[in-house]
């Protein structure tokens, strides 16, 4: 913490300008009025403060706004944003996409994923839902940031907005997030024809249930292995060899290359070996012919 000292009269600050770069930490602390700083935040980013000096300025703002900064200050944080912790950001109420854009630009190239995730969360809360303008801003200024949102926040996305989401925006989404987004995408693209529908729904298929994957296998979609590998394990395991063959089409030979990776490996273990042999790929590890499969989980559920 910065020591409290009185400000020498000749060092008194009446406006935020470049002369402040020559102030020592304790002089900044003693001489800069927090209210003046807040009022002239738009000048701060143009001044080449050291990181140590920025620490002092942050400390000033924290004292002035213990409940969180107002958006008028947040919008002009500039490089001071790099000093913020997720805990600081959690106190904010942000509604302006201009503020979001400004801070996303500042954070680029810095290791600030936790801070950015928290900022986006605050924007969604502040705006009430994840609307099209917010999604457009995220896809333009922070590809992949959509996946930093919790499933709960993503549930506020209206299906009409899903069309603005690009495949690369979903690259870092986990299964729980795709579970939320997939039904919305299904609804958003429901009026499209088979091939067009598949192109659009493909990035969301990590959230698809078995019955939807089975339905796709009847539509000659020729799913690539990259998409197949992203399907939920639970959605893949019940598929028959014939269904997988129809689903993958000419890409079926890729199963051989991926046979040691989940979910392919787990799926192979659930198939009869003679069914696997019909693919002619040399896949091994299926249930030997003549073996009886007992599903003990059914018996446990009944007892």
């Amino acid at each position: 913490d910065v020591e409290r000292t009185t400000c020498p009269p000749e060092k008194e600050v009446h406006e935020i300008d470049e002369s402040l770069i020559f102030y020592k930490k304790r002089e900044l602390e003693a001489c800069v009025d927090a209210a003046l700083l807040a009022a002239q935040m738009d000048r701060v980013d143009a001044i080449p403060f050291t990181y140590e000096q920025l620490d002092v300025l942050k400390h000033k703002l924290d004292e002035l706004y213990p409940q969180g900064y107002p958006e008028s200050v947040i919008r002009h944080l500039g490089h001071l944003f790099l000093k913020m912790s997720p805990e600081d950001i959690r106190k904010w109420n942000v509604t302006s996409l201009e503020t979001l854009k400004a801070l996303l630009k500042v954070s680029k190239g810095h290791e600030m994923s936790a801070q950015v995730a928290t900022l986006i969360d605050r924007v969604v809360v502040g705006r009430g839902q994840l609307d099209k303008d917010t999604v457009d801003t995220l896809t333009a200024f922070c590809p992949g940031c959509l996946c930093s949102l919790s499933p709960e926040r993503l549930s506020s996305v209206p299906p009409s907005v899903i069309g603005a989401v690009r495949p690369q925006d979903l690259d870092t989404c986990g299964p729980r997030q795709l579970d939320v987004l997939y039904p919305k995408a299904r609804l958003a693209f429901q009026n499209m024809s088979g091939s067009e529908y598949f192109v659009k729904i493909r990035p969301f298929l990590g959230g698809a249930p078995t019955e939807d994957v089975k339905a796709l296998s009847q539509q000659n979609v020729s799913m690539d292995l990259a998409t197949f590998m992203k399907l939920r394990r639970e959605a893949v395991l019940p598929l028959t060899v014939a269904e997988v063959q129809k689903l993958l089409g000419p890409h079926v030979e890729g199963l051989k290359v991926e046979e040691q990776h989940s979910p392919v490996r787990d799926w192979i273990l659930k198939q009869r070996q003679d069914d696997l042999d019909t693919l002619g790929l040399g896949l091994q590890g299926g249930i030997p012919n003549g073996y009886l499969i007992l599903d003990l989980s059914v018996r446990e559920a009944l007892s």
Epitope: D171, L225, H261
Partner: antibody
């Protein structure tokens, strides 16, 4: 432009570990597995294993099992290969190479990272 | 594991000549799962041919591949100065993936 950029050369003592990074750009990171291949001085190519960035699933060549660990960070499109219990025979150039999921050929390679193991 | 043996180890030829490189597998390889790479000193390998006979993007038509089962061939119809390098075959028909020992094509 598709690029794989690897971390710089390393000099390690026997028994130590080394962690090499490979940052991908210019393509959908989760549509390709990342494999690691090494080449000892004046020798041929040796496949070490791969990682599926989408699931984090790994497959290792039995020869390196227990010594190699491959990890990924989707947020930065980076994969890592850590090799432990280093010995002089591990002196080699280590390459990351991308492989479209469902195929087995490597269409883009990193520039290589030289790892020297010497006491 | 499948062992790939390349022959000859070194091939000494002049520009304009035809080069034929062989790759023999210790057990059968599915032809879709064989590729060839070129490597020049101090550089990373470069994909030439995949699935036995498909030319990779940007590779000149003088390169071609053929074969099935255990025997595969890479042919360079007329050697250009930039073709002098080491060539590796590679299989992903079974784990672990393996490479051949390489054939060095040098200027005679």
């Amino acid at each position: 432009e598709v690029q794989l950029v690897q971390s710089g050369a390393e000099v390690k003592k026997p028994g130590a570990s080394v962690k090499v990074s490979c940052k991908a750009s210019g393509y959908t990171f989760t549509d390709y597995n990342m494999d690691w291949v090494r080449q000892a001085p004046g020798q041929g190519l040796e496949w070490m294993g791969d990682i599926n960035p989408s699931t984090g699933g790994t497959i290792y060549n039995q020869k390196f099992q227990g010594r190699v660990t491959m990890t990924e960070d989707k947020s930065t499109s980076t994969v890592y290969m850590e090799l432990s219990s280093l010995r002089s025979e591990d002196t080699a150039v280590y390459y990351c190479a991308r492989r479209r999921i469902g195929t087995g050929y490597f269409d883009v390679w990193g520039q290589g990272t030289t790892v020297t193991v010497s006491s | 594991e499948i062992v790939l043996t390349q022959s000859p180890a070194t091939l000494s030829l002049s520009p304009g000549e035809r080069a034929t490189l062989s790759c023999s597998a210790s057990s059968s390889v599915i032809s879709s799962y064989l590729s060839w790479y070129q490597q020049k000193p101090g550089s990373s390998p470069r994909l030439l041919i995949y699935r036995t006979s498909n030319l990779a993007s940007g590779i000149p038509a003088r390169f071609s591949g053929s074969g099935s089962g255990t025997d595969y061939t890479l042919t360079i119809s007329s050697l250009e100065p930039e073709d002098f390098a080491v060539y590796y075959c590679h299989q992903w028909s079974s784990f672990p993936y393996t490479f051949g020992g390489g054939t060095k094509v040098e200027i005679k």
